[in-house]
């Protein structure tokens, strides 16, 4: 459903981002070519592959909003 | 100094209903993902339920899903936790907790009994 | 759900000696952005549990440096160098790296 692809989505937002934009990068400064289209196909199957695989991730870890927060609360400022 | 006051706990039989508050001062709320633990008397703990700083993630336990729901004011600084169909087995102190375990309130017992 | 034992279920220990419990997962508490998210806890009778350490061996803060805590993967150890008065009451470990949180059953330290 949508919803869980946009649950999904945001689960993965952390650590797919720079890898996206590496990949991006990459295959934009490579001319069209035989080769370019190969590395766009395995970028696209890649993905779809991962989000099988994170999506069974995102069931068996904790998502990231439920974990220990970077800053203390205690060094936090008074309500 | 950070405080978490939980209120809302009593006796109520199988079946029944309590909802459970968490008053939150000393600290920015709104920043903070929160939990409520449970403790048995003289037993170990067990997590309840989990829910993020705006209150659109959520988790539960599985064997509270369908019955608990959590949920946030940040604009009143208060967690909430809305216990429905009650089972001896719920019986407990629930404690309010900061994601991460660092600050707990004192707790408030919930007893559910005929 | 993993689960966490820990051993001993209860010790006696002289003021001045050192304690060790240990903790023991039924999978690596390793969680995917590498951090491994183990915690120890301290419940003193009649009060509600505090954090000692997070992230395995990291103290908070105003915890004596006598508490360390230590492992990696799925086995973890709390040693307490030094016990004092204190120190008594029930020592818990927990995880939060997946998505159903446990704890351990507790282990009670006695000060002789």
């Known amino acids: 459903s949508e919803a869980e692809d946009a649950s999904l989505l945001s689960f993965m937002q952390g650590y797919m981002k720079h890898a996206t934009k590496t990949a991006k990068d990459a295959l934009s400064s490579v001319q069209e070519s035989q080769v370019a289209q190969q590395a766009r196909g395995w970028v696209t199957d890649g993905f779809s592959s991962l989000k099988d695989y994170w999506s069974t991730v995102k069931d068996k870890f904790s998502e990231f909003w439920d974990l220990d927060p970077e800053v203390r609360p205690t060094s936090a400022v008074a309500a | 100094q950070l405080q978490l006051v939980e209120s809302g706990g009593g006796l109520v039989q199988p079946g029944g209903s309590l909802r459970l508050s968490c008053a939150a001062s000393g600290f920015t709320f709104g920043t903070y993902s929160m939990r409520w633990v449970r403790q048995v008397p003289r037993k170990a703990l067990e997590w309840v339920s989990s829910i993020s700083t705006d209150g659109g993630g959520t988790a539960y336990r599985d064997s509270v899903k369908g019955r608990f729901t959590i949920s946030r004011d940040n604009a009143k600084n208060t967690l909430y936790l809305q216990m429905n169909n009650l089972k001896p087995e719920d019986t407990a102190i629930y404690y309010c907790?900061?994601?991460?375990?660092?600050?707990w309130g004192q707790g408030t017992q919930v007893t559910v009994s005929s | 759900d993993v689960v966490l034992t820990q051993t001993p279920g209860s010790l006696s220990v002289v003021p001045g000696e050192s304690a060790s419990i240990s903790c023991k997962a039924t999978q690596s508490l390793v969680h995917i952005d590498g951090k491994t998210y183990l915690y120890w806890l301290l419940q003193k009778p009649g009060q509600s549990p505090q954090r000692l350490i997070y992230q395995v061996s990291t103290r908070d803060s105003g915890v004596p440096d006598r508490f360390t805590g230590a492992g990696s993967g799925a086995e973890f150890t709390l040693k307490i160098s030094g016990v004092k008065a204190e120190d008594a009451g029930v020592y818990y470990c927990a995880q939060d790296t997946y998505s159903t949180k446990t704890f351990g059953q507790g282990t009670k330290l006695e000060i002789k």
């Open positions: 907790v900061i994601a991460g375990y660092s600050d």
